[in-house]
């Protein structure tokens, strides 16, 4: 015997107090999907976090982060502070690169420079705390 | 026991007003997400309008926003909707529901009133 319930599109939730018809998902919920006994709370972005999508009744809402900040973490579910190109982020803030590492992005960790000599090379360019040293022949 | 109880509702011109009450009983209408639902003849249910995260915000469907305005007297436990520049498509039983949040996390409505019917004609 098919479930009445699975007759319910998304959009809506099959209403067990009333003879499992199909009733529209509340404001501020959402189902993404058909057959759904209840309807979902939408994200709210708040805080640092700003709408990039709005919630509609068949989609939850999408967030990014305000300017200086970046997501991180499945569908951003965390927002980190930016810091400028030759820094780094550590626990008392953003601090320039040690001598001999560099980072490019506004995120993640400095890296060493390649060790051009590894590969037979010389220096071409010197690293800088924003850029790694271009290797040469 | 959760109750609502709906009225107001009749026969009106286009371009009419009317306003909806709800008197809530079993629970405090201030401190719940509350809001009016809507059937029309042969259709499904459509949320028109609610006030949400204990009065923080307000929700009006598309087709009522600057028309249909939500409130509601705390002191008389009572929720209302008032309806102005009425047009046919605006013909339903209006019916007052409570947002019923669940312990794992989802969403649904109850509606414990007969609902009360808005007809729009001349």
């Known amino acids: 015997l098919q479930d009445p319930c699975s007759n319910c599109p998304a959009g809506t939730f099959c209403d067990n107090n009333r003879n499992q018809i199909c009733s529209p998902c509340p404001p501020n919920s959402f189902s993404s999907a058909g057959g759904q006994r209840t309807c979902d709370i939408c994200r709210q972005c708040k805080g640092v976090f700003r709408t990039r999508k709005e919630c509609s009744s068949t989609s939850n809402a999408e967030c990014d982060c305000t300017p200086g900040f970046h997501c991180l973490g499945a569908g951003c579910s965390m927002c980190e502070q930016d810091c400028k190109q030759g820094q780094e982020l550590t626990k008392k803030g953003c601090k320039d690169c040690c001598f001999g590492t560099f980072n490019d992005q506004k995120r993640g960790i400095c890296r060493p420079w390649t060790n051009c000599s590894l590969d037979g090379k010389s220096v071409l360019v010197n690293g800088t705390k924003e850029r790694d040293v271009v290797c040469g022949p | 026991e959760v109750q609502l109880l709906e009225s107001g509702g009749g026969l009106v011109q286009p371009g009419g007003s009317l306003r909806l009450s709800c008197a809530a009983s079993g629970f405090t209408v201030s401190a719940e997400d509350v809001g009016w639902v809507r059937q029309a003849p042969g259709k499904g249910l459509e949320w028109v309008s609610a006030?949400?995260?204990?009065?923080?915000?307000?929700y009006y469907a598309e087709s009522v926003k600057g028309r249909f305005t939500i409130s509601r007297d705390n002191a008389k436990n009572t929720l209302y909707l008032q309806m102005s520049s009425l047009r046919a498509e605006d013909t339903a039983v209006y019916y007052c529901?409570?947002?019923?949040?669940?312990?794992?996390?989802?969403?649904?409505?109850?509606?414990r009133g007969q609902g009360t019917q808005v007809t729009v004609s001349s």
């Open positions: 006030i949400l995260d204990s009065g923080g915000s307000t």
């Open positions: 529901a409570r947002v019923v949040y669940h312990s794992g996390g989802g969403v649904t409505f109850d509606l």
